[in-house]
Structure formats: structure tokens, C-alpha cells
Interface confidence: low
């Protein structure tokens, strides 16, 4: 029954880690910013700017930060827990059904309509049809 | 759904061996840890051995250590309890159970129906 | 003394609430800890009822009503199972386990039988 409860057990926050980048995992999960170690005893930090996590998990290597591509802006950096935020540069937009790229938004709309919507980084300039 | 099957379990003389089996079917059996834990006729719970996902890390109640050793083979969805020179008091109905994590925790969230062990001259 | 106790039996009226007590030794600081409880019905193997840690740290078994509901008494170092709107199928033995959010290595309470009145 000794065998209960060791240094082991404790909570991450109230375990001394040798290193401050390890902890121990709660409930066999990690928390965000870290992954497992392979015995499964530890969890390791994600290294800022190159890897991250964003929930409690039990994976084996932190996820691989996104770089935005050219084309894209990055908004907020990558951080422990927090992938890239990239968004399209000015006068172009991402389409929901084509994520990968940014498009070019339209310069002006067809004839016989009228714009009512600008272009943002996530929709083209919006037409609709002019009243007769 | 979530099955765990155990066999193996039988009479056998003090200083006998003799290996449990547990059949797992309904989840993904590789990605969790597994236990086996133990309860003697009228008793309470005993937890015998745990093992990880991948079957690199086994843990023992010092009760067992050294006689009994815990295995899995992820390709046929199995895990196993090989027990040697058993004793009276090793009597007692063998429990499969999943962990709900891939690791060991305390959260034991499946449960085979169990498999009798009888050690007696 | 070991480490988790249980009152051997406890019992309750149908219908009525009960709180089914497991007490952590005095060496060990029941804060950090999450509390485990099982269910084993005469004939039956262990079911896993829940995990309390905190209020907003908690998890329910696969298939257990809200009527079964952990806590935690800090002070007395104790953690409690809380059983709402007794049924006859509820009779049955209860064991705790606690201490090591991560720990490999598991002990349980020797358990606290339960008997619903009728």
C-alpha cells in the first residue's frame, strides 16, 4: 500500500520538475504546450515557435507549426499552444471550399449589379442584382 | 461495443504456473493501456499488472512481482498474465480491464467478466 | 492503517439519498488527488461509476446516470460518492481508489457495502 502515492503521482503543478520544460501527466494526458514521453513518466514542452498542442492530449510529438505562406500575412505567431494565424493579404481571400490558397478578390461586379460587400481576407466583394 | 473476454483461469497445484488470456474487441485495442486486477472468493479489488499501449512499460503490485508478468500482442487484440509459482493465496477471480487512457491511470473505464484461478493441493 | 478506508456497510432507504464515505490517511493530501469509484453488483464485475478531482475536473462512466455524484471534503481529507433516488439495483459493494492522477500503480478501499431498504 506504500506503493499508493509517489513524487509520481502528484499533479503537474505541484511537482518540482528536474527541468522546468517537464512535468507528469494528469490522468495519462499532457497539457496544452506539452506532449508525452515515450514511458509515458513525463511531459515535455513543445518548443516555441516550431511545434505546439492546443489540448490535453497524449500524443508522442508535439504538431508542426504552420509558416504562412507568400501571399498571407501572419497575424498572431506560433506559440506553445497556439498554431500560426496566417490570413490573406490585402485584395485577396481564402474560399471556404479552397483553403489551401488566396484568391484574388474581384476588382468590380458584373453588369447589372451592384456591390454591397468589400473584399476581405476571407470573402470576395459581395454583388447582388440591381433593382429594376 | 466495448468487450473484453478473459480465459485460461482453472485449478492448479502450489508452485504451478499457468497463462490468463483476455480477448478485446469493439475499440481500438493498441492505443490503450490495459490491467489486470484480482479478487479473491468474499475479498475486495486487488490490482495485479498494468501495461501501456505499447507494451514498453509494465508495472506489478509488489504482491506479484517477480512470478507474474504482463504482456500484449496488439496484432491479435490480445493481453496476457503469465503467473508462475503460484500460491493459495493467488485464488481468486482474474479481471481484464481497459484503461481510458493509453498510459496507466486509475480510471478503469471496461471490465472483462472475469476468469476463476484456483491454487490448491 | 491503510492508506484509503471505507465503512464496511451502509445502508439506505429506497428512494432516499446516501453519501458513501472514502477516507485518505493523514499523510496524504487528498487535494491532489482525484477520486475513483467502482460499483460491483453480487455475481457481476466492477463497473467504473465516475473520477472527481473538481468541479470542473470530473468524469462520468459510460452509461451512469447523473443520480451518482462525487465530491470532495478538503478539510477532512475525504471523498465522497453521492447516490440520489436509491434504487434496489444500487445495492451493491462501492470501492473507492485514489491518489495518483498518473500514478501506474493502483490501490483500492475495501469497498463499502451498500443496502437498500424497502
Known amino acids: 500500500e506504500s506503493a499508493l502515492i509517489t513524487q509520481q503521482d502528484l499533479a503537474p503543478q505541484q511537482r518540482v520538475a528536474p527541468q522546468q520544460k517537464r512535468s507528469s501527466p494528469s490522468e495519462g494526458l499532457c497539457p496544452p504546450g506539452h506532449h508525452i514521453s515515450e514511458d509515458g513518466r513525463d511531459c515535455i514542452s513543445c518548443k516555441y515557435g516550431q511545434d505546439y498542442s492546443t489540448h490535453w492530449n497524449d500524443l508522442l510529438f508535439c504538431l508542426r507549426c504552420t509558416r504562412c505562406d507568400s501571399g498571407e500575412v501572419e497575424l498572431s505567431p506560433c506559440t506553445t499552444t497556439r498554431n500560426t494565424v496566417c490570413q490573406c493579404e490585402e485584395g485577396t481571400f481564402r474560399e471556404e471550399d479552397s483553403p489551401e490558397m488566396c484568391r484574388k478578390c474581384r476588382t468590380g461586379c458584373p453588369r447589372g449589379m451592384v456591390k454591397v460587400g468589400d473584399c476581405t481576407p476571407w470573402s470576395d466583394i459581395e454583388c447582388v442584382h440591381k433593382e429594376s | 461495443e466495448v468487450q473484453l473476454v478473459e480465459s485460461g483461469g482453472g485449478l492448479v497445484k502450489p508452485g504451478g504456473s499457468l497463462r490468463l488470456s483476455c480477448a478485446a474487441s469493439?475499440?481500438?485495442?493498441?492505443?490503450?493501456?490495459m490491467h489486470w486486477v484480482r479478487q479473491a472468493p468474499g475479498k475486495g479489488l486487488e490490482w495485479v499488472a498494468g501495461?501501456?499501449?505499447?507494451?514498453?512499460?509494465?508495472y506489478y503490485a509488489d504482491s506479484v512481482k517477480g512470478r507474474f508478468t504482463i504482456s500484449r500482442d496488439n496484432a491479435k487484440n490480445s493481453l496476457y498474465l503469465q503467473m508462475n509459482s503460484l500460491r493459495a493465496e493467488d485464488t481468486a477471480v482474474y479481471y481484464c480491464?481497459?484503461?481510458?487512457?493509453?498510459?496507466?491511470?486509475?480510471?478503469?473505464?471496461?471490465w472483462g467478466q472475469g476468469t476463476l484461478v484456483t491454487v490448491s493441493s | 492503517q491503510p492508506v484509503l478506508h471505507q465503512p464496511p456497510a451502509m445502508s439506505s432507504a429506497l428512494g432516499t439519498t446516501i453519501r458513501l464515505t472514502c477516507t485518505l490517511r493523514?499523510?496524504?493530501?487528498?487535494?491532489?488527488?482525484?477520486v475513483y469509484w467502482y460499483q460491483q453488483r453480487p455475481g457481476h464485475p466492477p463497473r467504473f461509476l465516475l473520477r472527481?478531482?473538481?468541479?470542473?475536473?470530473?468524469?462520468?462512466g459510460p452509461q451512469v446516470p447523473p443520480r451518482f455524484s462525487g465530491s470532495k471534503d478538503v478539510a477532512r481529507n475525504r471523498g465522497y460518492l453521492s447516490i440520489s433516488e436509491l434504487q434496489p439495483e444500487d445495492e451493491a459493494m462501492y470501492y473507492c481508489?485514489?491518489?495518483?492522477?498518473?500514478?501506474?500503480?493502483?490501490?483500492f478501499g475495501s469497498g463499502t457495502q451498500l443496502t437498500v431498504l424497502s
Open positions: 469493439g475499440f481500438t485495442f493498441s492505443t490503450y493501456g
Open positions: 481508489a485514489m491518489g495518483a492522477r498518473s500514478s501506474v500503480t493502483h490501490v
Open positions: 501495461i501501456n499501449y505499447s507494451g514498453n512499460n509494465k
Open positions: 472527481y478531482f473538481s468541479q470542473s475536473d470530473k468524469s462520468q
Open positions: 480491464a481497459r484503461d481510458h487512457s493509453t498510459w496507466l491511470s486509475r480510471h478503469l473505464d471496461y
Open positions: 493523514n499523510d496524504h493530501d487528498i487535494g491532489v488527488y482525484s
